[in-house]
């Protein structure tokens, strides 16, 4: 139903606490450079205004759209142009163009220092002084670094953060209590951020149909007992919620998400038996629980897929009469039977089936043409299975660091134009997928690997779009969302690349490397490795092994030496000469 005042409606639905949190997230995600204090001031102004509208929905400006109210607030900031430059030009536009303009200025890679965690004592002191302000600061710092973070989920993580501090700040050993809890929150929040970023990219770059297909596959895997009609209803609501959050309409998004959770709990009998444990929880936990829910057991006695999608003489008629419904049904039926497949695989299979029908239904004897469709789709299943098996074998053999090195070489050969720090960052991220997924049982390995790779490649694509350097990367990123991973996997050595001239500076090390934490030491070595590949992209595996072995021996020798710097100065040039000879 239509409300006189949208902002009053959302304030009433969400309550003051969540309302303020969401306003803070909205401002922090759009104005990523502004200090916390400025945002707090604006949050209080918006909240006071909303309260006035609750008291009198007909009061001045209360009838305006929320996005317009936010836009007006932003455009009234006196220092907007000097802080944000051309973002201020958005203010000359009318809504909805102004909203779109603001969105385009969100920065996925803001130039902000890493979000460092203070010592437990300092954390607890600040928390006890003013816990609302402390949690507000957490929302602000996360939001400005992750401008597409799923806002209602961020409120959930803030609540978890608050609970951890409430408990651990009373503990005798604060660090022992806090560290594992905060590490777990951080890791989960980073995955959540990447998942939402993929959803927004899917909607923004590939459209609603792509997002709906993704959602049908995921929900069908989780709720295999639900009917297709029920899945479709949820997907329609979920699409609305996701569009709102991706579009920066966070109050509407959070409110509609609450409504969706309520609907699912009211209809849990026709969705999933697993919802029971979620539906007794309070608002934020309820929606989070549903998002993370374990998949339901498969219904017994499911008929063979071929019955409806191959043997049935009505296939082309059904395809012609309601193409999206028919393909949606295929995706639903296939996904609920295959919880072990990744979303990407399921969507590629559905795409392959669609392409086959497009071809066969135009023939005089369609059935003869599509009779073997499932056999023809088998390579779409075999390829990722084989890839995961090979990579997990390599991971088991080399360990995480060695596996990262192998990936650094592989990806530098695929896209040598990409900057060295970026290649190292992605080799490390891709390598960590081995740690996350390779130890899982066979049934979970495949989906774990491909679903994580989709998140990492999406981040790569977003950053590459900002500063494109490789046509091959652009092609893999933009042609098809579901074929991104196979596209990157299929890239080999870039034959068009002119090797980088040899710079001794890239391979010069000093004694300071010896005292670096292990992670930073690895990054330094991996930077050198990437530079080496850029210099000799066609070097063999054996040559690379030799060079890396010499390099490790050199570092060990000099870091163990009494006069470390002298060792580096003397042996460094010898190592560089030896490496050049090995690679010649």
């Amino acid at each position: 139903e239509a409300h006189k005042s949208e902002i009053a409606h959302r304030f009433n639905d969400l309550g003051e606490g969540h309302f303020k949190g969401l306003v803070l997230i909205t401002l922090s995600q759009h104005l990523q450079k502004s200090p916390f204090e400025e945002h707090v001031k604006l949050v209080n102004e918006v909240t006071d205004f909303a309260k006035a509208c609750v008291a009198d929905e007909s009061a001045q400006n209360c009838g305006k759209a929320i996005a317009t109210l936010f836009g007006d607030k932003v455009c009234a900031i006196p220092s907007l142009r000097e802080t944000y430059g051309e973002l201020a030009d958005c203010c000359a536009k009318e809504d909805p163009d102004r909203v779109e303009c603001f969105l385009q200025h969100k920065d996925d890679n803001p130039n902000l220092p890493p979000f460092e965690r203070p010592e437990p004592e300092a954390l607890c002191t600040a928390f006890k002084e003013n816990n609302d302000r402390f949690i507000g600061h957490y929302l602000y710092e996360v939001s400005r670094r992750h401008p597409y973070f799923y806002a209602p989920e961020l409120l959930y993580y803030a609540e978890k953060y608050k609970n951890a501090l409430t408990e651990c700040c009373e503990a005798a050993d604060k660090a022992a209590c806090l560290t594992p809890k905060l590490d777990a929150i951080k890791e989960k929040a980073l995955v959540s951020s990447a998942q939402q970023r993929l959803k927004c990219a899917s909607l923004q770059k590939f459209g609603e149909r792509a997002f709906k297909a993704w959602s049908v596959a995921r929900l069908s895997q989780k709720f295999p007992k639900a009917e297709f009609a029920e899945i479709s209803t949820i997907v329609t609501s979920l699409t609305k919620v996701t569009k709102e959050c991706c579009h920066g309409d966070l109050l509407e998004c959070a409110d509609d998400r609450q409504e969706l959770a309520k609907y699912m709990c009211e209809h849990q009998d026709s969705i999933s038996s697993k919802l029971k444990e979620c539906c007794v929880k309070p608002t934020l936990q309820k929606a989070h629980c549903i998002l993370e829910i374990q998949r339901d057991e498969l219904p017994t006695e499911l008929p063979d897929l071929a019955v409806d999608f191959v043997e049935d003489k009505e296939v082309c008629k059904n395809f012609a009469e309601a193409k999206d419904v028919f393909l949606g049904t295929f995706l639903y039926e296939y996904s609920r039977r295959h919880p072990e497949y990744s979303i990407g695989m399921l969507l590629r299979i559905a795409k392959g089936y669609e392409a086959k029908l497009e071809k066969c239904c135009a023939e005089a004897d369609p059935h003869a043409c599509y009779a073997k469709v499932f056999d023809e789709l088998q390579p779409l299943i075999d390829e990722p299975k084989k890839l995961v098996q090979q990579n997990c074998e390599l991971f088991d053999k080399l360990g995480e660091y060695g596996f990262q090195n192998a990936l650094a070489v592989r990806y530098t050969q695929k896209a040598p134009q990409v900057s060295t720090p970026t290649l190292v960052e992605y080799a490390r991220k891709l390598g960590s997928v081995g740690t996350k997924c390779c130890s899982l049982p066979e049934t979970e390995r495949l989906s774990c690997t491909e679903n994580y790779l989709a998140l990492i490649l999406n981040r790569l694509c977003i950053l590459h779009e900002k500063t494109p350097v490789s046509e091959r990367v652009t092609k893999c990123c933009t042609e098809s969302l579901v074929n991104r991973r196979p596209c990157f996997s299929a890239l080999h050595v870039d034959e068009t690349y002119v090797p980088k001239p040899f710079h001794a500076d890239s391979f010069t090390f000093h004694a300071d490397i010896c005292t670096l934490p292990e992670k930073e030491k690895q990054v330094k070595k991996q930077m050198a490795l990437v530079e080496l590949v850029k210099h000799k992209p066609k070097a063999s595996e054996e040559q690379m092994k030799t060079v890396m072995g010499d390099f490790a021996a050199f570092l060990k020798k000099c870091c163990d030496a009494d006069n470390k710097e002298a060792c580096f100065t003397e042996d460094g040039p010898k190592l560089v000469a030896k490496c050049q000879a090995t690679l010649a």
């Epitope: 003489k313 009505e314 296939v315 082309c316 008629k317 395809f319 012609a320 009469e321 497009e358 239904c361 135009a362 023939e363 005089a364 004897d365 369609p366 059935h367």
Partner: nanobody, 115 residues
């Protein structure tokens, strides 16, 4: 919505001819092979003939081969069945269908072959 409207049926003597038409709408006509199916009183549906989306390939049931000709005009979204040398056993309701479907979408058109 998909719509198939058949026309051109009637009463004809054995050995006579008829031309059936099927006007299609609500889908991309050129992307689908089309078929004619018939159903005699008290019997199940029987496939008669099919044609590819481009019109280049045709298939016929043995019972009509050499007597019936299927064709299509993609510019008019229309499917045709030219029936020559009609026999009493050709008496049936004729339906056009999408792909190899045997179930009808339209109302059909009645062909009666009788002296």
């Amino acid at each position: 919505d998909v719509q198939l409207v058949e026309s051109g049926g009637g009463v004809v003597q054995p050995g006579g001819s008829l031309r059936l038409s099927c006007a299609a709408s609500g889908f991309t006509f050129t992307s689908f092979g089309m078929s004619w199916v018939r159903q005699a009183p008290g019997k199940g549906p029987e496939w008669v003939s099919s044609i590819s989306g481009s019109g280049s390939d045709t298939l016929y049931a043995d019972s009509v081969k050499g007597r019936f000709t299927i064709s299509r005009d993609n510019s008019k979204n229309t499917l045709y069945l030219q029936m020559n040398s009609l026999r009493p056993e050709d008496t049936a309701a004729y339906y056009c269908t999408i792909g190899g479907s045997l179930s009808r979408s339209g109302q059909g058109t009645l062909v009666t072959v009788s002296s």
